[in-house]
Interface confidence: low
Amino acid sequence: LQDPCSNCPAGTFCDNNRNQICSPCPPNSFSSAGGQRTCDICRQCKGVFRTRKECSSTSNAECDCTPGFHCLGAGCSMCEQDCKQGQELTKKGCKDCCFGTFNDQKRGICRPWTNCSLDGKSVLVNGTKERDVVCGPSPADLSPGASSVTPPAPAREPGHSPQ
């Protein structure tokens, strides 16, 4: 025998108190799949969270963060304070990048400047707190006619040699 609850569509629940008929989800609740015996409570976007998408009978609300903060985690479960470029967030608040490091975003951490000499290049443009250095041609290439400029190496990804 087929479970009568399997006929209940998303946005409803199978109400055991009413002979397993399909009842609409109550206000501020939802069911995103059919055959549910309960509806889930809608997420409420309060405080530093703001509503990006309202809850409906078939889908949960989605939150993002108020200006000055950005989302962290799956489904924006946390909001973290923005910093300025050239800074990183610590428990003591936003802190300027130390000399030799930079951060070109409002989030994340300060990263070391590219070491141009590792690739046999020279520094074409010095780094700042907000920008990486720009590596230029190797000193030996600095001869008439040599004009190519190499962009900075991309940030290291896992799987490459450790720092």
Epitope: L72, G73, M78, E80, E88, T90, K91, K92, Q105, R107, G108, I109, R111, P154, A155, R156, E157, Q163
Partner: nanobody
Amino acid sequence: EVQLLESGGGLVQPGGSLRLSCAASGFTFGDYAMSWFRQAPGKGLEWVAVLSYDGSNTDYADSVKGRFTISRDNSKNTLYLQMNSLRAEDTAVYYCAKGPLILAAGNYWGQGTLVTVSS
């Protein structure tokens, strides 16, 4: 210089447990949120968990929620990942990372520790 050294990986049977550690140095560990990521063979990088600087806030990828626990000991400059009810799909190289970045380029990474779940 920031250094992160993961350990604790190995071969474990499905349903088993492992505890990964990440020893941090070169920065004030207790001032920063920390994260775990993983990379399965032939796959892209996947965020696993994040922990606030004081350990009061955690968040997990849906794929590990209820099975993995991220924690830290600021007095030992060490981050942990307790992995329970391991599945074959948890097989990956696990990396700890300074900062709470979710799949953002340019984080500080360790060298990783391999976790293999197989019978």
